[in-house]
Interface confidence: low
């Protein structure tokens, strides 16, 4: 396998960098490659066998503030004739992404980093049958 | 930035918009959530679209392993287990947020950066060009 | 201040296995990659292994993989090395070190203990 | 692997005099080197990182130079606490490899 670059994590002279309490980190919210977009497959959650809708949630303490995130239409799949087909299942794929969490205690607000699920889409998959001895 | 409600009893100092630089807090909420989609679910090998899973690893960024799925097929597989080429596979892309260090020589400074992962795939009736 | 301090070195026989353990004070042990280096008698520093701060990112050197195994105890503040099938040429002085990068490894070492010896002999 | 050669072995000087040690890399690693001091019985000290940023607490008499494959700790004026081995450390790919270590001894 590829032997991954460890690159220019470097470290600096104190001075030269932000001085950051113990426990914390000093984060830019100016994000890189802002104005990358989805390139994906026209319409392929009302395409999908196993289509979905998406849901956009809204967080105004939460950056970003929009998260949307996808339902599956169907437990089965849709087949050829477009009927469901619930001998398959359609399930949700999930990917994680961080966010930034800024809490309010009283006056002060502090900013804590967040793993956060999201569903992304959802695919048509054979179930898995358990046989009852 | 996102506008931030404020408690009207608090000085009004502070922008409401979200800060271009913030101070976070180490504890990453949620760090210890499973990372590897191969031991979450078996549904990239299940699926009629199946996909093959690409360790993504940049030591430089947080997380430093991302899963990139890459369809296996061109079409979808059926349940006979030939592949259907009136059907596609095709990849289902998210933008996520990660942590890079900038400046680069700062231990303790990061920027977020948006990048684009393919997570699965899902099988699609395809779009049909017609010829005039 | 940083301190880091190993224990669980001692004579092994070829074939044996020892536990390394590092424990680490002054800063907070869970925010930060930890690795184990080494170095033979009269010899270089040779590293063998880091951890990630959660313990999720793992790598080895190709002389100890498969035998060594590194891990964390982030409520104990403490690292750990794993050593099995120990081989001859696996004598020498362990040292636990500190990553200087937070959350994301720098892959340079800012903090050191002072090591424990690890002999391996009939 | 990238392997780091580090010459000479060992060297006698003098307080007072310049003094250079040289680490040669396999491949290109860019400026991603580091030099350790290491001295009897102690474990190493980080002193150069980016092939010529001086970590904090070190004295300017040490410098660090060179890019690519050719690196160069120079020490402008060696002193008493000089003596010792140096050793430099790529940090550009895994698995992280350090040079064979330059012995610094008194004349």
């Known amino acids: 396998r590829k032997i991954p670059k460890v690159g220019h994590t470097f470290f600096q002279k104190p001075e030269s960098c932000p001085p950051v309490p113990e426990g914390s980190m000093k984060l830019d919210t100016g994000i890189i490659n802002e104005n990358q977009r989805v390139s994906m497959s026209r319409n392929i959650e009302s395409r999908s066998t196993s289509p979905w809708n998406y849901t956009v949630t809204w967080d105004p303490n939460r950056y970003p503030s929009e998260v949307v995130q996808a339902q599956c239409k169907h437990l089965g799949c849709i087949n050829a004739q477009g009927k469901e087909d619930i001998s398959m299942n359609s399930v949700p794929i999930q990917q994680e992404t961080l966010v930034l969490r800024r809490k309010h205690q009283g006056c002060s607000v502090s900013f804590q980093l967040e793993k956060v699920l999201v569903t992304v889409g959802c695919t048509c998959v054979t179930p898995v049958v358990h046989h009852v001895q | 930035g996102i506008a931030i409600p404020r408690n009207s009893g608090c000085p009004n100092s502070e922008d409401k918009n979200f800060p271009r630089t913030v101070m976070v807090n180490l504890n990453i909420h949620n760090r210890n959530t499973s990372t590897n989609p191969k031991r979450s679910s078996d549904y990239y090998n299940r699926s009629t679209s199946p996909w093959n899973l690409h360790r993504n690893e940049d030591p430089e960024r947080y997380p430093s392993v991302i899963w990139e799925a890459k369809c296996r097929h061109l079409g979808c597989v059926k349940a006979d287990g030939n592949v259907d080429y009136h059907m596609n596979s095709v990849p289902i892309q998210q933008e996520i947020l990660v942590l890079r260090r900038e400046p680069r020589h700062c231990p303790n400074s990061f920027r977020l950066e948006k990048i684009l992962v393919s997570v699965g795939c899902t099988c699609v009736t395809p779009i049909v060009h017609h010829v005039a | 201040q940083v301190q880091l301090v190993e224990s669980g070195g001692g004579l092994v026989k070829p074939g044996g296995s020892l536990r390394l353990s590092c424990a680490a004070s002054?800063?907070?042990?869970?925010?930060?990659?930890m690795t184990w280096i080494r170095q033979a008698p009269g010899k270089g520093l040779e590293w063998i292994s880091y951890?990630?701060?959660?313990?999720?990112?793992?790598y080895y050197a190709d002389s100890v993989k498969g035998r060594f195994t590194i891990s964390r105890d982030n409520a104990q503040n403490s690292l750990y090395l794993q050593m099995n099938s120990l081989r001859a040429e696996d004598t020498a002085v362990y040292y636990c070190?500190?990553?200087?990068?937070?959350?994301?490894?720098?892959?340079?070492?800012?903090?050191w203990g002072q090591g424990t010896t690890v002999t391996v002999s009939s | 692997a990238i392997q780091l050669t580090q010459s000479p072995s060992s060297l006698s000087a003098s307080v007072g005099d310049r003094v250079t040690i040289t680490c040669r890399a396999s491949?290109?690693?860019?400026?991603?080197l580091a030099w350790y001091q290491q001295k009897p019985g102690k474990a190493p000290k980080l002193l150069i990182y980016?092939?010529?940023s001086l970590e904090s607490g070190v004295p300017s008499r040490l410098s660090g130079s060179g890019s690519g494959t050719d690196f160069t700790l120079t020490i402008s004026s060696l002193q008493p606490e000089d003596f010792a081995t140096y050793y430099c450390?790529?940090?550009?790919?895994?698995?992280?490899?350090f040079g064979g270590g330059t012995k610094v001894e008194i004349k």
């Open positions: 491949q290109g690693i860019s400026s991603a």
């Open positions: 450390q790529q940090f550009n790919s895994y698995p992280l490899t």
């Open positions: 980016d092939a010529s």
């Open positions: 002054g800063f907070t042990f869970s925010n930060y990659y």
């Open positions: 070190a500190r990553d200087g990068g937070v959350i994301i490894s720098t892959a340079m070492f800012d903090y």
């Open positions: 951890i990630s701060s959660t313990g999720g990112n793992i």
